[in-house]
Amino acid sequence: RPSFSLVEDTTLEPEEPPTKYQISQPEVYVAAPGESLEVRCLLKDAAVISWTKDGVHLGPNNRTVLIGEYLQIKGATPRDSGLYACTASRTVDSETWYFMVNVTDAISSGDDEDDTDGAEDFVSENSNNKRAPYWTNTEKMEKRLHAVPAANTVKFRCPAGGNPMPTMRWLKNGKEFKQEHRIGGYKVRNQHWSLIMESVVPSDKGNYTCVVENEYGSINHTYHLDVVERSPHRPILQAGLPANASTVVGGDVEFVCKVYSDAQPHIQWIKHVEKNGSKYGPDGLPYLKVLKAAGVNTTDKEIEVLYIRNVTFEDAGEYTCLAGNSIGISFHSAWLTVLPAPGREKEITASPDYLE
């Protein structure tokens, strides 16, 4: 098998994955444009594996190779960024593992997020040695073209020195770059010779030039930013969740629903109930009761879990996690089975895939 490698990114915590309103954070894998990458589906006992990207079936092509539990992408581009999933189909059930692929050096200009080496870029000169501006770290400036998924943070750096200490200003497409030129403005960290733009949008595309100058001279360097838009999709719900559960009368149970969404999702927990001994109304529709909905007093994390305390026989039945956004609706359902309490003991039997 050809050896491709993809490093799982555990250091870029401040960098949000491209999915803007993702409630559950899947693992994020990062690769630079042009690299080949490989991801292994982290599911056990996978007889048949199918792959999706942003909810759409992913098949092999001239750049995508699917071999067993491995997904290989040759010559990655920012358009390969997105929410991926591998589903293992077994005889009895199926399980899905989600992960993000981010094809970009999202912190740009070869820098890491926390600027730990920033002090080294701020070079102090002997006051007698007058000197025109010069670049102190050209390695961090080699990559001129930056293709970044929308909603990511971009940082351009121009580490420089000189005496007296040069000043830095930024141009966009050759003109002075003003705060009001973009929603949310931008940050300039003079100490680190950097320009930072958060949550980039397509209108941020263009050429960004740093101009570093003092009384003895001026130098400049231009970066090109391309913002790659991800196509939005209706909410994606993690397969296998919520999971069927069983408990005894008086026990507690919880259902978990993990939602991935580009647009702000609305989430509700719905119970299929009976009225006058019937599950269906005169119109043939099931009777539904909204148990929990995202609102002013409910956080995203809270809405993901439906807790049922001190369960009674009436709680048995079908529970649905319903998620909708401006694009569409998705839902997953699970069943709660309520068993009689054995004697005075209260026992809970629930599969570990939904209890945290």
Partner: antibody, heavy 120, light 110 residues
Framework: QVQLVQSGAEVKKPGSSVKVSCKAS????????ISWVRQAPGQGLEWMGR????????NYAQKFQGRVTITADESTSTAYMELNSLRSEDTAVYYC?????????????WGQGTMVTVSS | QSVLTQPPSASGTPGQRVTISCSGS????????VNWYQQLPGTAPKLLIY???QRPSGVPDRFSGSKSGTSASLAISGLQSEDEADYYC???????????FGGGTKLTVL
């Protein structure tokens, strides 16, 4: 048995707007979505968008984005579809249909249709 | 041009079995379930099959649906004269973010 009853036929001039109503009688209104589908004379079906009263949000087909507005009044169990900047090719029968999310976006009950003619 | 592809016409004699195909792509049929509608002349469409192969109550078991990969098909066994109608397949499309229909198949009972 639930029924979707639509407003009557309309004749409109190019550039104007039309608003078609769809009233649900005899059943639950807010639990499911109401979709709008149109059919030009002798042509196939075309989905325009839907309103999801349970969330208070609407989804629109890309083709109609910005030109169509779908709303709902839960107190009267009525959905509305307004189409702006009408042109002759908008001449069609406009149907509302109950959109069952639990049946993977199947339209299980349809209105009788409203004929909209756009002519100068 | 419809997103889902159906043959424009199909025909059969009473009692025969007829199959109507519906071809799509990975973003619609490949990723989502298929619904089938019957439209009798001059009437509104009627749901025939939902979620690939489920029949709503009131639909005869002569109608059945199936799906494989990016294609789906509707089978009508024991063809009857009242089955003469237009048949449409439909599915959600993850790329277009909406419901897409086939162009329709006109079924003639000879």
């Amino acid at each position: 048995q639930v029924q979707l009853v639509q407003s009557g036929a309309e004749v409109k001039k190019p550039g104007s707007s039309v608003k078609v109503s769809c009233k649900a009688s005899g059943g639950t209104f807010s639990s499911y979505a109401i979709s709008w589908v149109r059919q030009a004379p002798g042509q196939g079906l075309e989905w325009m968008g839907r309103i999801i009263p349970i969330f208070g949000t609407a989804n629109y087909a890309q083709k109609f984005q910005g030109r169509v507005t779908i709303t709902a009044d839960e107190s009267t169990s009525t959905a509305y579809m307004e189409l702006n900047s009408l042109r002759s090719e908008d001449t069609a029968v406009y149907y509302c249909a109950r959109d069952r999310w639990d049946w993977n976006d199947a339209f299980d009950i349809w209105g009788q249709g409203t004929m909209v003619t756009v002519s100068s | 041009q419809s997103v889902l592809t159906q043959p424009p016409s199909a025909s059969g004699t009473p009692g025969q079995r007829v199959t109507i195909s519906c071809s799509g792509s990975s973003s619609n049929i490949g990723s989502n379930t298929v619904n089938w509608y019957q439209q009798l002349p001059g009437t509104a469409p009627k749901l025939l099959i939902y979620s690939n192969n489920q029949r709503p109550s009131g639909v005869p078991d002569r109608f059945s649906g199936s799906k494989s990969g990016t294609s789906a098909s509707l089978a009508i066994s024991g063809l009857q004269s009242e089955d003469e109608a237009d048949y449409y397949c439909a599915a959600w499309d993850d790329s277009l973010n909406g419901v897409v229909f086939g162009g329709g198949t006109k079924l003639t009972v000879l």
